[in-house]
């Protein structure tokens, strides 16, 4: 892609580069305890870690961003680790008519890349 | 969206929060001077700036990421400023058979959000 090839091996050491990590959170943590009923505890996969040069680049823009960050670090930020895809979850809500199941398509990350 | 409402006014002051900024780069900067013929100078729109709580949240995931970053800053990173859309650009390439025009759909950012 654009004569720059993204790489998948982390040069910073294991677990340091952009990856998916599970964070446990309660509805209280999220401020949702008054309107989501269940489950009260969620396993939230999130994208964490650094984005060294060419690591898991999302696209051409990310590749040139990495390059320009090397040249102008004060002006151009390094790419950062964000979700590339999501996995849906279902939550039980209190509604006017009782309880309903609602799907969230963009709550839990499924994959990560550097953008 | 999920009872947390993203906001569009920057609490850090003008120009500090996630926004689109134009960066001028030469083909030499990008390492493309051997295979891209024209233009020699590119205006590259990139996403820069901070993502304070709820600012331009991309989706539900970004909203909860901001919330959890407030509770566990060492574990959960703050959302970061990345492209929400791109604008295509055309570059003139040197090819085996001469010169061709190639469109890049993901080279120049058109909008930014916090993800």
């Amino acid at each position: 892609s654009a004569h720059l090839h993204p790489r998948d091996s982390c040069p910073l050491g294991p677990g340091r580069c952009c990856h998916l990590e599970t964070v446990q959170a309660t509805l209280e943590d999220l401020g949702w305890s008054d309107w989501v009923l269940s489950p009260r505890q969620l396993q939230l996969s999130m994208c964490v870690g650094e984005c060294p040069h060419l690591y898991r680049s999302a696209n051409t823009h990310a590749l040139i961003k990495a390059r320009l960050h090397g040249l102008q670090p004060d002006r151009v930020p390094a790419p950062c680790c964000v979700p590339s895809s999501y996995t849906p979850v279902v939550l039980m809500h209190r509604t006017d008519s009782g309880v309903s199941l609602q799907t969230y398509d963009d709550l839990v990350a499924q994959g990560c890349h550097c953008a | 969206s999920a009872h947390l409402h993203p906001r569009d006014s920057c609490p850090l002051g003008p120009g500090r929060c996630c926004h689109l900024e134009t960066v001028q780069a030469t083909l030499e900067d990008l390492g493309w001077s051997d295979w891209v013929l024209s233009p020699r100078q590119l205006q590259l729109s990139m996403c820069v700036g901070e993502c304070p709580h709820l600012y331009r949240s991309a989706n539900t995931h970004a909203l909860i990421k901001a919330r959890l970053h407030g509770l566990q800053p060492d574990r959960v990173p703050a959302p970061c400023c990345v492209p929400s859309s791109y604008t295509p650009v055309v570059l003139m390439h040197r090819t085996d058979s001469g010169v061709s025009l190639q469109t890049y759909d993901d080279l120049v950012a058109q909008g930014c959000h916090c993800a």
Epitope: L37, S38, P39, R40, T87, P88, V90, M92, G98, L101 | -
Partner: antibody, heavy 119, light 107 residues
Framework: QVQLVQSGAEVKKPGASVKVSCKAS????????INWVRQAPGQGLEWMGW????????NYAQKLQGRVTMTTDTSTSTAYMELRSLRSDDTAVYYC????????????WGQGTMVTVSS | DIQMTQSPSSVSASVGDRVTITCRAS??????LAWYQQKPGKAPKLLIY???SLQSGVPSRFSGSGSGTDFTLTISSLQPEDFATYYC?????????FGGGTKVEIK
């Protein structure tokens, strides 16, 4: 490990009521809901309703509305299902089951309680 | 209410056979479908959730696929302990509903 343990078998007369208990262990009881599902002899599974252990909010199957009540006691991590005005076609094995979780999974089931309705 | 239609209602198969069971929802249920195995006198056991995710501890010969209205449970190589009744279940909306079941019998 996560477990749901139900009360023992019951024999009831038509018109009577039955109350089945389901004691949870191995997880935070208030983090999940409890479903009640029944299975008549030789038949398939029929969902009766759901209760959140946290707040007591319920959702009952329409055909049982008015005859069924589901409750929880958080101090003992126990869920209860009471069925009133019993009829012979209420004869079934009654199961409690934890869920749905965030992936709509009903993952842990009790061993079942046989309720026989006979005159 | 969402109706869940399972087919076939029974299947005769031999050890080592590949067995496929289908489940159709009367309306779209996204990927909110689960598969259960039940043996006589026992409670149902969760095999697959979210249409294709294998429950922890379940052998990898079980797999699920599909989304929307059409779903499949596949047992790649039937083992003696797999002879049982299988149910699909939707949890896209209340009331939660089950399919009628598929009995996998020894040929």
């Amino acid at each position: 490990q996560v477990q749901l343990v139900q009360s023992g078998a019951e024999v009831k007369k038509p018109g009577a009521s039955v109350k089945v208990s389901c004691k949870a262990s191995g997880y935070t009881f208030t983090s999940y809901g409890i479903n009640w599902v029944r299975q008549a002899p030789g038949q398939g599974l029929e969902w009766m309703g759901w209760i959140t252990a946290y707040s007591g909010d319920t959702n009952y199957a329409q055909k049982l509305q008015g005859r069924v009540t589901m409750t929880t006691d958080t101090s003992t991590s126990t869920a209860y299902m009471e069925l009133r005005s019993l009829r012979s076609d209420d004869t079934a094995v009654y199961y409690c089951a934890r869920g749905p979780g965030q992936y709509a999974d009903v993952d842990v089931w009790g061993q079942g309680t046989m309720v026989t309705v006979s005159s | 209410d969402i109706q869940m239609t399972q087919s076939p209602s029974s299947v005769s198969a031999s050890v080592g056979d590949r067995v496929t069971i289908t489940c159709r929802a009367s309306q779209g249920i996204s990927s909110w479908l689960a598969w259960y195995q039940q043996k006589p006198g026992k409670a149902p056991k969760l095999l697959i959730y979210a249409a294709s995710s294998l429950q922890s501890g379940v052998p990898s010969r079980f797999s699920g696929s599909g989304s929307g209205t059409d779903f499949t449970l596949t047992i790649s190589s039937l083992q003696p302990e797999d002879f049982a009744t299988y149910y699909c279940q939707q949890a896209n909306s209340f009331p939660i509903t089950f399919g009628g079941g598929t009995k996998v019998e020894i040929k």
